[in-house]
């Protein structure tokens, strides 16, 4: 009966026409929502003026459905037995789901301001930058609404600036109208063992930000993983979001919807320092802002997003060091609201359900040369907002995979 | 490569005026930002006037503002900078610089010396 079974599960979740696995792959049953929390800027100008602690409130949820659209230029290649794809980006807003509008206005910190005097550091460029910054009426802070704020504005301060600069700002943007990838995934046709698991992301199967292991492209993108998924496993997978391959580790067994799936979770290992996990060295890029790779829990992704100073974070800074924090007040971390986990189903693999947990931040430094930036004492690592992505599969869904899988091995 | 050459430089009496020009070459001027910076003796290179690529924005030091004027022209690949009411305060090496975002630094010019005294 077992080599029956395993027989038949090797034979569904296979990535080609015809299997469970592809119909599902291709275009997710599953419906996937990211939603945001801002953190709304309550003491913009004592922060500029004095170098005040930032002191934060988050608003939100404001809820958008993605994931909704089919993987595009789905091409099998049966020479190294690989399938390849773009997963075209979407986001419609939920007002139902959200606690506002789109057109609901936050006081956050300057995008452009903080990345241009980050970019550019020689104090000729930044006598020019502070010219234009104060000719656009810029500031440290700026008021925005959420749709500029995630998905873009014409920034007065970039309009200035001369040729070759993009004047829109937002922190997805572009984002409609874009895809990720190509990624190039194993299709287990000839070894299921394999099956998901990425070969290589745009062409490589490296990704040219980090140096040595941190540099790899490891595992499948966490939408499923090769079956027979043991608790003993350390689950590898890549994720563009985070410009970086990541893992996740047996936690607990979890009953959803009367299937037996394994949580697995991010680990707080993860994100540690090389002072504590010493394979985490080639995650530290430069030595201020890491105080010599003592700090933990953000990591800089400036080189994957064109030198811009963003800091991926787990939200409210979990399992990020005090000194990351301290400058910012209205933090309220917790594991059960802020980790990563997947709820992984072990006989195919399939993530049933998950929730993908980061927060964005980005670095604003004093700067003797900027008017907006001169009374600052100390770098800050400035939380912008928080997002949470969840997906879980639908009872219909559910009660299929109990009959099919689940049901015919108990 | 590269050049810009400053001209227009001399000893003036205070009230009176200069006009200071820079010819640039090796590069698509229209695409710059075209500034004009002075380092005094014993202090700190500081920017005097900017003018943006299109050339619809200029800015001023606070203390050159009314007084002094940047203008370009692209078809000449030129940039100036009137200079009235001449200040002995104003005495410094004036020096021309073109700069986009592609540049982690400006390009600079050598410069040209003005003297404010009677």
């Known amino acids: 009966g077992d080599l029956l079974i395993q027989k038949t599960i090797k034979k569904q979740v296979v990535l080609e026409e015809g299997t469970i696995a592809f119909k599902n792959w291709v275009k997710t049953g599953t419906e996937v929502y990211r939603q945001f929390w801002i953190f709304d800027v309550q003491n913009p100008q004592e922060v500029m003026m004095n170098s005040s602690n930032i002191q934060v409130k988050q608003r939100g949820p404001y809820t958008y459905r993605v994931r909704f659209l089919a993987k595009e230029n789905v091409t099998q290649d049966a020479e190294d037995n690989t399938v390849s794809f773009l997963q075209p980006n979407g986001a419609i807003f939920e007002p139902s789901l959200s606690v506002g509008t789109e057109a609901d206005n936050f006081t956050v910190l300057n995008l452009a301001v903080a990345a241009a005097s980050h970019i550019y550091q020689n104090q000729f460029v930044q006598m020019i930058l502070n010219s234009l910054i104060n000719k656009s009426k810029s500031s440290m802070f700026q008021v925005r609404t959420l749709r500029e704020l995630l998905w873009g504005y014409r920034d007065p301060f970039l309009s200035l600036v001369p040729y070759p600069v993009t004047t829109t700002v937002g922190l997805f943007y572009p984002y409609n109208n874009t895809a990720d990838g190509v990624y190039k995934v194993f299709n287990g046709k000839d070894n299921i063992s394999k099956v998901a698991i990425i070969d290589t992301y745009k062409g490589k199967r490296n990704l040219s930000y980090w140096e040595s292991h941190c540099d790899m492209i490891n595992g499948t993108d966490a939408a499923s993983f090769p079956p027979f998924v043991e608790k003993s496993q350390v689950l590898q997978f890549f994720s563009s979001d985070i410009c970086r391959s990541i893992y996740a580790v047996f936690e607990s067994d979890v009953n959803l919807k009367g299937i037996p799936v394994y949580r697995f979770v991010l680990p707080s290992k993860a994100f540690a320092s090389p002072v504590e996990n010493p394979d985490n060295y080639c995650f530290c890029t430069e030595k201020i802002i890491s105080k010599n790779c003592t700090s933990y829990g953000v990591l800089d992704i400036s080189k994957c997003k064109e030198g811009r100073p963003v800091y991926i974070s787990l939200p409210h800074f979990l399992y990020a060091s005090p000194d990351v924090s301290e400058p910012i007040d209205g933090l309220n971390p917790n594991e059960e609201e802020h980790r990563t986990y997947l709820d992984i189903e072990p006989i195919t693999g399939f993530t049933l359900q998950f929730a993908k947990r980061l927060q964005v931040n980005l670095l604003v430094k004093p700067s003797e040369k900027i008017q907006v930036l001169k009374n600052l004492k100390r770098n800050y690592i400035v939380p912008i907002l928080w997002l949470n992505e969840t997906g879980t599969i639908g009872d219909e869904k559910a009660n299929m995979f109990r009959s099919q899988v689940t049901g015919k091995i108990n | 490569q590269v050049q810009l050459q400053e001209s227009g430089g001399g000893l003036v009496q205070p009230g009176g005026s200069l006009r200071l020009s820079c010819a640039a070459s090796?590069?698509?001027?229209?695409?710059?930002?075209m500034s004009w910076y002075r380092q005094a003796p014993g202090k700190e290179r500081e920017l005097v006037a900017l003018?943006?690529?299109?050339?619809?924005?200029?800015d001023y030091a606070d203390s050159v503002k009314g007084r002094f004027t940047i203008s370009r022209d692209d078809a000449e690949k030129t940039v100036s900078l009137q200079m009235n009411s001449l200040k002995p305060e104003d005495t410094a090496v004036y020096y021309c610089?073109?700069?986009?975002?592609?540049?982690?630094?400006?390009?600079w010019g050598q410069g040209t010396q003005v003297t404010v005294s009677s």
């Open positions: 610089s073109a700069w986009r975002a592609s540049l982690y630094e400006p390009y």
């Open positions: 090796g590069f698509t001027f229209s695409s710059y930002a």
């Open positions: 003018i943006t690529s299109a050339g619809g924005t200029t």
